[in-house]
Interface confidence: medium
C-alpha cells in the first residue's frame, strides 16, 4: 500500500507542495489522515497528519469544548492506495468571535499562544490579548496547555493558551480519536505564563490557617477551624461534545478546482458558540478536490 | 472555465519596480494556493513564490528574497507580485500559476519583463 | 544548473516510445515528495502533464506515462505523435531549497 505522507503543525506542512508518498510496511493495509483544529476567541490552528495507518477503514469527526476552547478533530482511514488526501487542509483567514472588535475588553489579559511553537510560547515571551466575553459566556479565565494529535505512529503537539471561561480548572482535558486538548486555568491578569505544576488547590478554597498555640494563663479558644479534606471542589467542567463538522468531498479528477491551505478547513461549530462557531466560515468546498502535487 | 491573466509586465531598468497582477476567474480563488513562475528567455522554468489560499503564508525562492513580495486580494480574485530592486537576471515571462490539489494545474499566458539600461 | 537534472534532448520517430528521466537527490525526489510533469509547446504557457508521480489529468492521453523509483522519476511517451514535439519538465519539492524545484527542460524532436 502506498500513502500520502505529511506532518503539518500550525503551518504549511502538509501544503501541496509538500506532499510525500510513502510506501507502508507489509501487513499494514490503510492509509490514514487526522486533522485537528483548535479555536481560541483570539484565532485557530491546527493540526494534521498523513500517512499509513492501522486499524479498519472509516471516518471518526467530532467536535469538542474545553471551557470555551473549541477543538474539531477528523480521521479517515482508507483501503487504496494514496487515498488519504480526502480531507480539506484549507482554512480561511479567521475573523475571531465573528467580529473581535465588536465586543468590549471586559479587562483581563492571558498569554496568548495560537499555532506558535513550544519555544516562541515559553513563559512571558507571548503575545498578550485582552479577553472579552462572546456568546453570552464570560471569559475571564486564562488557560495553559497543549493539543496532541496521534496518528501514522506520528505524534503532533503544539501549546495552547488565551482566554477561556474557566478561571479555576486544573488539569482538565478533553479527548477525541487520536486528539488531546488539555490544560489548566487560573484567575486574574496573565496569570497563565505556566501553569505545567498547578496543583489541585484553588483561591475558592479557603486557606489552611495556623493558629498560635494557647497561651497557658488563657482559657482555651472557643474559636474552631474547620479544614476540609476531601476533594478540592471545582466548577463542573463545561466539556461537552459538539456536533461532528461535516467531511469533504472526496478528491477527484484533476480539472477540478484546486484547494489548499496551511490549516486544515473544518465545516461547522459548536453548538451555543454561533458568534465564534465559524460555522459560516467554513463552507463545504464547491466541486471535487484536485488531485495534484503541489510546488512544481 | 478556469482563466488566468497576467498584467504589468514591461521595460524596467536596474533597480527599479514592477508590479504584476494576475486575474482569476472560473473556479474558487480564496480557496485556491497561487504561485508565480517565471522563464527567461530560451531558458527553463523557475519557480518564483506562492502564497497561501488566505494569504497568510507566504514563500519565495532565495533569488528573489528580500526583493519580491507577493500578495492576493480574495475580493477581487487577483494575485500581485510586487518586484522591487530589479536586475538584468530577473528578465523573464512571469506565469501565474494555480496550484491544484498538488501540482500547477493551470497556468496564464504569461507576462515579459524586461530589466535593461 | 537545475536541481533535477533531465537531458536537455531526445528525439523519436512517430510511433515510437520515448523516455525521459529525471534525476533529483535524497532532498527532493529521493525524500519522497511527488513528481510532476509539464509540457510546453512552442511560443505557449506549460501545461500539467502528469502529477503525483504517475496520475494524469482529464485530457491527457494514455500515451504518457510517468514513474518515481529512488530519486529518480521519468516520463515515457509511446505512440509518438509530431503534436507532441514541445518541451517536457518534471518538478519536486525541495527539503533544502524550500520550494518547488524544475528540471531544466528537455526538448523533444519528433523526426
Known amino acids: 500500500l502506498e500513502c500520502y505522507s505529511c506532518v503539518q503543525k500550525a503551518d504549511d506542512g502538509c501544503s501541496p507542495n509538500k506532499m510525500k508518498t510513502v510506501k507502508c510496511a507489509p501487513g499494514v493495509d490503510v492509509c490514514t489522515e487526522a486533522v485537528g483544529a483548535v479555536e481560541t476567541i483570539h484565532g485557530q490552528f491546527s493540526l494534521a497528519v498523513r500517512g499509513c495507518g492501522s486499524g479498519l477503514p472509516g471516518k471518526n469527526d467530532r467536535g469538542l469544548d474545553l471551557h470555551g476552547l473549541l477543538a474539531f478533530i477528523q480521521l479517515q482511514q482508507c483501503a487504496q492506495d494514496r487515498c488519504n488526501a480526502k480531507l480539506n487542509l484549507t482554512s480561511r483567514a479567521l475573523d475571531p468571535a465573528g467580529n473581535e472588535s465588536a465586543y468590549p475588553p471586559n479587562g483581563v489579559e492571558c498569554y496568548s499562544c495560537v499555532g506558535l511553537s513550544r519555544e516562541a510560547c515559553q513563559g512571558t515571551s507571548p503575545p498578550v490579548v485582552s479577553c472579552y466575553n462572546a456568546s453570552d459566556h464570560v471569559y475571564k479565565g486564562c488557560f495553559d496547555g497543549n493539543v496532541t494529535l496521534t496518528a501514522a505512529n506520528v505524534t503532533v503537539s503544539l501549546p495552547v493558551r488565551g482566554c477561556v471561561q474557566d478561571e479555576f480548572c486544573t488539569r482538565d482535558g478533553v479527548t477525541g480519536p487520536g486528539f488531546t486538548l488539555s490544560g489548566s486555568c487560573c484567575q486574574g491578569s496573565r496569570c497563565n505564563s505556566d501553569l505545567r505544576n498547578k496543583t489541585y488547590f484553588s483561591p475558592r478554597i479557603p486557606p489552611l490557617v495556623r493558629l498560635p498555640p494557647p497561651e497557658p494563663t488563657t482559657v482555651a479558644s472557643t474559636t474552631s477551624v474547620t479544614t476540609s479534606t476531601s476533594a478540592p471542589v471545582r466548577p463542573t467542567s463545561t466539556t461537552k461534545p459538539m456536533p461532528a463538522p461535516t467531511s469533504q468531498t472526496p478528491r477527484q479528477g484533476v480539472e477540478h478546482e484546486a484547494s489548499r491551505d496551511e490549516e486544515p478547513r473544518l465545516t461547522g461549530g459548536a453548538a451555543g458558540h454561533q458568534d465564534r462557531s465559524n460555522s459560516g466560515q467554513y463552507p463545504a468546498k464547491g466541486g471535487p478536490q484536485q488531485p495534484h502535487n503541489k510546488g512544481c | 472555465e478556469v482563466q488566468l491573466l497576467e498584467s504589468g509586465g514591461g521595460l524596467v531598468q536596474p533597480g527599479g519596480s514592477l508590479r504584476l497582477s494576475c486575474a482569476a476567474s472560473g473556479f474558487t480563488f480564496s480557496s485556491a494556493w497561487m504561485s508565480w513562475v517565471r522563464q527567461a528567455p530560451g531558458k527553463g522554468l523557475e519557480w518564483v513564490s506562492y502564497?497561501?489560499?488566505?494569504?497568510?503564508?507566504?514563500y519565495y525562492a532565495d533569488s528573489v528574497k528580500g526583493r519580491f513580495t507577493i500578495s492576493r486580494d480574495n475580493s477581487k480574485n487577483t494575485l500581485y507580485l510586487q518586484m522591487n530592486s530589479l536586475r538584468a537576471e530577473d528578465t523573464a515571462v512571469y506565469y501565474c500559476a494555480r496550484e491544484g490539489l498538488w501540482a500547477f494545474d493551470w497556468w496564464g499566458q504569461g507576462t515579459l519583463v524586461t530589466v535593461t539600461s | 544548473q537545475s536541481v533535477l537534472t533531465q537531458p536537455p534532448s531526445a528525439s523519436g520517430t512517430p510511433g515510437q516510445r520515448v523516455t525521459i528521466s529525471c534525476s533529483g537527490s535524497?532532498?527532493?525526489?529521493?525524500?519522497?515528495?511527488?513528481v510532476h510533469w509539464y509540457q510546453q509547446l512552442p511560443g505557449t504557457a506549460p501545461k500539467l502533464l502528469i502529477y503525483d508521480n504517475n496520475q494524469r489529468p482529464s485530457g491527457v492521453p494514455d500515451r504518457f506515462s510517468g514513474s518515481k523509483s529512488g530519486t529518480s522519476a521519468s516520463l515515457a511517451i509511446s505512440g509518438l505523435r509530431s503534436e507532441d514535439e514541445a518541451d517536457y519538465y518534471c518538478?519536486?519539492?525541495?527539503?533544502?531549497?524550500?520550494?518547488?524545484?524544475f528540471g531544466g527542460g528537455t526538448k523533444l524532436t519528433v523526426l
Open positions: 502564497i497561501s489560499s488566505s494569504g497568510s503564508s507566504t
Open positions: 518538478a519536486a519539492y525541495d527539503d533544502s531549497l524550500s520550494g518547488p524545484v
Open positions: 535524497s532532498s527532493n525526489i529521493g525524500a519522497g515528495y511527488v
